[in-house]
């Protein structure tokens, strides 16, 4: 029985150009964690294997660092970034858990419009 | 001014499908989100799911996959979500809704989809 | 998927009165940056839902100010200084931190 649950950053609001890190937590179980896949819609960004350590897809290897921890660095963002990113963790013996995260990236012009966050 | 027009109701049989319209205007349609949301008995909101018009990616509620398909035209500023194998619990009214920074800005004006044979 | 809950269900008021509703959420609805995705939106009769407050506290252009939204982590409020005839309707609240976003069941809020 699958008992673990994936903590994930939240949905990340960012202006085009800047960087922002992807982050899952696996918890509430005890299965090892044998990879972690990042994937966005149905590209394959990175993978991080237990034993091999880390490999970014070669289109991305220019704006994706590796961490911190099993999460993923992106850099210079583009509105073309905008979308949904997956972590998936393959353990054992539960299988597969997966965390689902969105990511907005504005053009600065559109940041500077509608719906603005106050600083505190 | 923001406008999101959505296309007229809908009696279909059970068993088809169908294709609601959204039409904006007023804004950079590729510079925003495109959600769609289903309101049932006049009361309950769900999120459907949503689209990126600049690059055609989608995001969904599980609970619609495989019963909603979000596309968009970016030669006409229109978004559509398509309903597919309609039963009674498909009946219900579904509004689209741009969003910025994951909150939703500006509301279609609804599409009623009665379900019945 | 994060639930959302509201209170009360049904709120009766008389113009003038000031009115709580509160939303809930069964996670903490801040990101690993600080920002908390959680909106309130007034749906009137006949009309499409419209947005009031944005990321806990922001009122929406064109909202006016006695509508008021606080809270934090999971427990979120929104205020009503004076209610006025326009104010009546269902009111609900939205988390889009986590996927998929969810919303609250409705407060209506009618007269008395």
């Known amino acids: 029985m699958m008992t673990g649950t994936i903590e994930t950053t939240g949905n990340i609001s960012a202006e085009k150009g800047g960087s922002i890190i992807l982050q899952c937590h696996l918890s509430s179980t005890t299965a090892q964690v044998t990879q972690v896949n990042w994937e966005q819609q149905d590209q394959l960004l990175a993978i991080c294997n237990a034993d091999l350590g880390w490999h970014i897809s070669p289109s991305f290897k220019d704006r994706v660092a590796p961490g911190p921890g099993l999460g993923l660095t992106l850099q210079s963002l583009t509105v073309n970034d905008t979308g949904e990113y997956f972590c998936i963790y393959h353990t054992y013996p539960d299988g597969t858990y997966t965390g689902r995260i969105f990511l907005e990236v504005l053009e600065s012009s559109v940041a500077e419009h509608g719906a603005r966050f106050q600083i505190p | 001014e923001v406008q999101l027009q959505q296309s007229g109701p809908e009696l279909v049989k059970p068993g088809a499908s169908m294709k609601i319209s959204c039409k904006a205007s007023?804004?950079?349609?590729?510079?925003?989100?495109m959600n769609w949301v289903k309101q049932s008995h006049g009361k309950n909101l769900e999120w459907i799911g949503l689209i990126v018009p600049n690059n055609g990616g989608t995001s969904y509620n599980q609970k619609f996959k495989g019963k909603a398909t979000l596309t968009v035209d970016k030669s006409s500023n229109t978004a559509y979500m398509e309903l597919l194998s309609l039963t009674s619990e498909d009946s219900a009214v579904y509004y689209c809704?741009?969003?910025?920074?994951?909150?939703?800005?500006?509301w279609g004006q609804g599409t009623t989809l009665t379900v019945s044979s | 998927d994060v639930v959302v809950t509201q209170t009360p269900l049904s709120l009766p008021v008389s113009f003038g009165d000031q009115v709580s509703i509160s939303c809930r959420s069964s996670?903490?609805?801040?990101?690993?940056?600080?920002?908390?995705?959680l909106s309130w939106y007034l749906h009137k009769p006949g009309q499409s839902p419209q947005l009031l407050i944005y990321g806990i506290s922001n009122r929406f252009s064109g909202v006016p100010d006695r509508f008021s939204g606080s809270g934090s982590g999971t427990d979120f409020t929104l205020k009503i200084s004076t209610v006025k005839p326009e104010d009546l309707g269902m009111y609900y609240c939205l988390q889009n931190t986590h996927q998929p976003p969810t919303f609250g069941g409705g407060t209506k809020l009618e007269i008395k």
């Open positions: 809704a741009r969003s910025l920074r994951f909150s939703f800005d500006y």
């Open positions: 007023g804004y950079s349609f590729t510079g925003y989100i």
């Open positions: 996670q903490s609805l801040a990101n690993s940056y600080g920002t908390t995705y």
